[in-house]
Interface confidence: low
Amino acid sequence: NLSQDDSQPWTSDETVVAGGTVVLKCQVKDHEDSSLQWSNPAQQTLYFGEKRALRDNRIQLVTSTPHELSISISNVALADEGEYTCSIFTMPVRTAKSLVTVLGIPQKPIITGYKSSLREKDTATLNCQSSGSKPAARLTWRKGDQELHGEPTRIQEDPNGKTFTVSSSVTFQVTREDDGASIVCSVNHESLKGADRSTSQRIEVLYTPTAMIRPDPPHPREGQKLLLHCEGRGNPVPQQYLWEKEGSVPPLKMTQESALIFPFLNKSDSGTYGCTATSNMGSYKAYYTLNVNDPSPVPSSSSTYH
């Protein structure tokens, strides 16, 4: 003896990304010699058993048996969202409803507001916007591996009344370490299934130069050739160099090249050397104390020639 519930069809709610495919599956234990039917939110019949009722090539039959009717809808649009009804025409008619939720995929974010010629310690403000998400997406900011705390995401309904445009801005003080850094705005949304959808803005920061003096060879000896390299860093890179030997008044100006060359080191070359590296952002002076070591021991005459 079958209970009345055996003729009650069942189905499930489905979530699909816009442009994707959703499968609607309806099952019944006792069909009572009746066919299953699927209809859309507008109450138009889609399939009655294995018979197509609506001319829409996106809708295809997957399974039609006395106990199951499954159909697929491809290239799902936001307008397809709503309650789909599975019916079985027993006495009385029994129905089951499947709520189809269509996710709107957020567009690739757009970053605006970048102003070039940022200087160290300036404040930068960037704006990020992404349209088309449903439900509303969330925006996050990062600089390299570091998360930036932007304003909370602002949400605005798109003209279609279904999707949303989200926007956020971030403000931060730039340092010289930010020169060449990428500020990334990422959109987080369930439709992306963890995939990254982001836009980056590379920033340039102008900053005062620094310099370091590097000896080549590192441990110079009397009689050797020595190059002192003045390695200037900055943005812009220093273009002017001035070498001075300290201790004389005024200091002895030696060369305006980035490298100071000693073709043949003397003990008298010992002393403190200064290199001033200059760009249009300013100047920086680095110092190097040169101690000329004794020459390497001369090999004995017996091993000089072979």
Epitope: E120, R176, T210, I213, A286, Y288
Partner: nanobody, 124 residues
């Protein structure tokens, strides 16, 4: 966990000497610059001296030139500040600092890791 630990501070008479040490642990700092800064009571933090990754290039504040010497021993991951001819105005907390990159910088903004500081008091 990056740690910089200063030592060697203390009370010294004017004209005396002290040698400060800064030991680094948690990562190899031998490829990075290192700097000493100081902060006197009621004043801001000021640059004292810095040394590049090889020890070949050093830089000193005007107040430290000729009296202080910065050096490093990469095998011990330690940087030293030898302070001679100390004056009362050298009284301060001395901080060791290291940047997170190889890029040299001689001002405080260029440094990412800081020690807790060691107190140097110059008084008769």
């Amino acid at each position: 966990q990056v740690q910089l630990v200063e030592s060697g501070g203390g009370l010294v008479q004017p004209g005396g000497s002290l040698r400060l040490s800064c030991a680094a642990s948690g990562r190899t700092f031998s490829n990075y610059a290192r700097g000493w800064f100081r902060q006197a009571p009621g004043k801001g933090r000021e640059f004292v001296a810095a040394i590049d990754y090889s020890g070949g290039s050093t830089n000193y504040a005007d107040s430290a030139k000729g009296r202080f010497t910065i050096s490093r021993d990469n095998s011990k991951n330690t940087v030293y500040l030898q302070m001679n001819s100390l004056r009362a105005e050298d009284t301060a907390v001395y901080y060791c600092a290291a940047p997170a990159s190889r890029r040299p910088s001689w001002d405080a903004d260029g440094y990412d890791y800081w020690g807790q500081g060691t107190l140097v008091t110059v008084s008769s």
